[in-house]
């Protein structure tokens, strides 16, 4: 080994070196939290970049760059260090116009703590292992969600556009002429029935067990879907999102009530099956796989 490499190895294995890097990262994180940093922090920023560059140079000189088994770039944790340094120089010395997006990558410096603290490294390792093991469960989950999204698409496509429409129009007005002019919230409130405090028109349906309109109103299929158009089963992607919402139980009772009012109470069977299979079974299966992965990592 050359004298330079021997010195690099000595520095790299020294505990003070690890302490220096850890303190630098933590100090850097403190500086990043500043709202309006003073001008002198610019020099501190250069110092941090210098220390990170020195750390990487020491590692490269001690281990080699990329040729060989234990070289710098063969360790995934060093990829993070490398990216941090590259972005530090890019944002400082290369004029890229609007660099605010690139400055966001400075946050990656905080992740360097993981590679420095050994316990944290183990936990993150276990997390990565659990994600690898989760792939099969994820495939099963996506498959199940897709199947139920397709069923939902067939059963409820367009149903959430059913609204209670006013039974009195001007002489020149027809349903289509109104459909073509509906734009503002005011227009909607003029022609549709709204429950007090509701931001969406009252839903209704054409089957006997679906929601009925109050006197003076008729059920029609007009306008957008509820919740600013985000709640629907009109396309596979929207249906998939609705099913994901059911699986995660994210305000699912509202979706359940909306759909049952528009399609009919019979369809509660669909929701019972989805909640039991998706929410109770699949979610717990995911948790079980994560628990198993952590257990294996600990052993």
């Amino acid at each position: 080994f050359s004298p330079l490499r021997r010195i690099s190895i000595k520095i790299l294995v020294h505990s003070l070196f690890s302490m220096l890097i850890m303190c630098t990262i933590l100090t850097n994180c403190i500086f990043m939290t500043m709202n309006n940093p003073p001008d002198w922090t610019k020099n501190v920023e250069y110092t941090f970049t210098g220390i990170y560059t020195f750390e990487s140079l020491v590692k490269i000189l001690a281990r080699g760059f990329c040729v060989g088994e234990f070289t710098f770039l063969r360790d995934p944790w060093n990829w993070l260090d490398f990216v941090v340094i590259v972005f530090a120089y890019l944002t400082e010395f290369v004029n890229l116009g609007n660099v605010s997006a690139l400055r966001t990558f400075r946050v990656l410096r905080a992740l360097k703590t993981i590679s420095v603290i050994p316990g944290l490294k183990t936990i993150v390792g276990a997390l990565i292992q659990s994600v690898k093991k989760l792939s099969d469960v994820m495939i099963l989950t996506v498959f199940c969600l897709s199947v139920f999204a397709l069923i939902g698409l067939q059963l409820f496509m367009g149903n959430l556009k059913h609204k209670c429409f006013r039974n009195s129009l001007e002489n020149n007005e027809t349903l289509e002429s109104i459909m073509n002019t509906l734009e503002s919230e005011e227009d909607f409130r003029k022609y549709f029935y709204y429950l007090e405090g509701s931001k969406d028109a009252l839903l209704c349906g054409f089957s006997t067990d679906s929601g009925q309109c109050p006197e003076g109103y008729t059920c029609v299929k007009i306008g957008r879907n509820p919740d600013y158009g985000y709640t629907s089963f009109d396309t596979f992607s929207w249906a998939f999102l609705a099913l994901f919402r059911l699986m995660t139980q994210d305000y699912w009772e509202n979706l359940y009530q909306q759909t049952l009012r528009a399609a009919g109470k019979t369809y509660m069977i669909f929701f019972v099956v989805v909640i039991f299979l998706g929410s109770f079974y699949l979610i717990n299966l995911i948790l079980a796989v994560v628990a198993m992965a952590y257990e294996e990592q600990n052993q």
Epitope: M157, G158, H162, F165, N167, S168, L169, T174, L175, E176, S177, M179, F206, E215, G216, T218, C219, V220, K221, I222
Partner: nanobody, 124 residues
Framework: EVQLVESGGGVVQPGGSLRLSCAAS?????????TGWYRRAPGKQRELVAR???????QYADSVKGRFTISRDNAKKTVYLQMNSLRPEDTALYYC?????????????????WGQGTLVTVSS
């Protein structure tokens, strides 16, 4: 294809009567907001004559009030327009309009569905 069947048109003398009927016989017609009669006289725009909402309330053009009566038979899915005291200015092509919801089998669709029209001629 959605079809409204109109009938009852013809030639009548001034002061005479006619009864037009519009049948939405197809099972595709689910629920209307209203079903009405419109007319287009030669060289003029199409205008509302009368319409009846699904709850039974009616609406008439000022020119026909007191002379024309619109009614419906829900069982037969038919709307009638009884025209009395006809005048030469009532001469026009009378169209039936179903403004409501139809079923395509796969989904529901709301909009305006027009008939082919039936000709009413009032002349001596």
């Amino acid at each position: 294809e959605v079809q409204l069947v109109e009938s009852g048109g013809g030639v009548v003398q001034p002061g005479g009567s006619l009864r037009l009927s519009c049948a939405a016989s197809s099972r595709q017609f689910i629920r209307d907001v209203f079903t009405g009669w419109y007319r287009r006289a030669p060289g003029k725009q199409r205008e509302l004559v009368a319409r009846i909402y699904n709850e039974g309330n009616t609406q008439y053009a000022d020119s026909v009030k007191g002379r024309f009566t619109i009614s419906r038979d829900n069982a037969k899915k038919t709307v009638y327009l009884q025209m009395n005291s006809l005048r030469p200015e009532d001469t026009a092509l009378y169209y039936c309009l179903f403004s409501g919801t139809i079923s395509t089998g796969r989904e529901y669709r709301s909009g305006d569905y027009w008939g082919q029209g039936t000709l009413v001629t009032v002349s001596s």
